[in-house]
């Protein structure tokens, strides 16, 4: 004869564990039903009654089978710098990711807490390291013999064209100007682009650079405290 199927709640055999989607309630000392995703335990089980589950309220969720007394709060609404790639439902948290042309400056377990715009290197500077989804563009001054005349998050410094006779010497932000119509060697027309994992920023959202100059130095900092805790107010 097949073994009799036990219905929750039931006392487990000594040394055995509760079945899938069940949990052991320490107080009742019984195997009891878990609540399904999108629900939480409204009333815990006893020796004679099983777990009573209830649906998560608006702006809260549970993603797994559980026996939590309250559903988890969905994260804050996505900021204007972000795109909601997963909505807050009873079974899943909201996920915010950065919009094109921005990178994740502060990540969280899923998605991004703070997006910032990819830096645009100004004329005289080229991209030394392209931006990624999680790191900003690094700019460097154009070395002698190279230039960049654009404000761009993708353009690198390009070599000056080589002239038979130079009319105007090139500098870090301008190509050389030749007197003859055909220089001996010139780069292909147009800016040189680095591979760009993040799309370039749309015109209406790009920050306004204020050019000036300062010496370039850098050193690493130790990690400091975390930013303020994320709000859990939903829609």
């Amino acid at each position: 004869l097949p073994a009799q199927v036990a219905f929750t709640p039931y006392a487990p055999e000594p040394g055995s564990t509760c079945r899938l989607r069940e949990y052991y309630d320490q107080t009742a000392q019984m195997c009891c039903s878990k609540c399904s995703p999108g629900q939480h335990a409204k009333v815990f089980c006893t020796k004679t009654s099983d777990t009573v589950c209830d649906s998560c309220e608006d702006s809260t969720y549970t993603q797994l089978w559980n026996w939590v007394p309250e559903c988890l709060s969905c994260g804050s609404r996505c900021s204007s710098d972000q795109v909601e790639t997963q909505a807050c439902t009873r079974e899943q948290n909201r996920i915010c990711t950065c919009r094109p042309g921005w990178y994740c400056a502060l990540s969280k377990q899923e998605g991004c807490r703070l997006c910032a715009p990819l830096r645009k290197c100004r004329p005289g500077f080229g991209v030394a390291r392209p931006g990624t989804e999680t790191s900003d563009v690094v700019c460097k001054p154009c070395a002698p013999g190279t230039f960049s005349n654009t404000t761009s998050s993708t353009d690198i410094c390009r070599p000056h064209q080589i002239c038979n006779v130079v009319a105007i010497p090139g500098n870090a932000s301008m190509d050389a100007v030749c007197t003859s119509t055909s220089p001996t060697r010139s780069m292909a027309p147009g800016a040189v682009h680095l591979p760009q994992p993040v799309s370039t920023r749309s015109q209406h959202t790009q920050p306004t650079p204020e050019p000036s100059t300062a010496p370039s130095t850098s050193f690493l900092l130790p990690m400091g405290p975390s930013p303020p805790a994320e709000g859990s107010t939903g829609d």
């Epitope: 703070l114 900003d136 370039s216 130095t217 690493l220 900092l221 400091g224």
Partner: nanobody, 124 residues
Framework: DVQLVESGGGLVHPGGSLRLSCAAS????????ATWARQPPGKGLEWIST????????TYADSVKGRFIISRDIAKNTVYLQMNNLKPEDTGMYVC?????????????????WGQGTQVTVSS
């Protein structure tokens, strides 16, 4: 101890001004990018402005362009956010960060040092 401390927040009427300060201790702010962000009530963190250490370039979010000015005083190891013509939608917790250029290779997805924030409320 490496830390940033923001101050200067408060309650102000629409059209008013505030000057936020972000004082660094335990490290030199002069070699780092400085960023201000804010968290409006019930919303996520929003980027406001960045001042790049190497070129002193300043960038601003469209929502604050022409009203906010980021600056720094290297001698005082402090970064400022001058906020003019404030609007109710500027209400929120303002935090500043210091990051080394281009982010850390070890922790590329995180800003380096964060302050705890200063509350700004714009209301009539």
């Amino acid at each position: 101890d490496v830390q940033l401390v923001e101050s200067g927040g408060g309650l102000v009427h629409p059209g008013g001004s505030l000057r936020l300060s972000c004082a660094a201790s335990g490290f030199t702010f002069s070699a780092d990018d400085a960023t201000w962000a804010r968290q409006p009530p019930g919303k996520g963190l929003e980027w406001i402005s960045t001042l790049y250490f190497d070129t002193e370039e300043k960038t601003y979010a469209d929502s604050v362009k022409g009203r906010f000015i980021i600056s720094r005083d290297i001698a005082k190891n402090t970064v400022y956010l001058q906020m003019n013509n404030l609007k109710p939608e500027d209400t929120g917790m303002y935090v500043c960060t210091a990051t080394w250029a281009g982010g850390s290779l070890l922790r590329p997805a995180s800003f380096g040092v964060w302050g705890q924030g200063t509350q700004v409320t714009v209301s009539s």
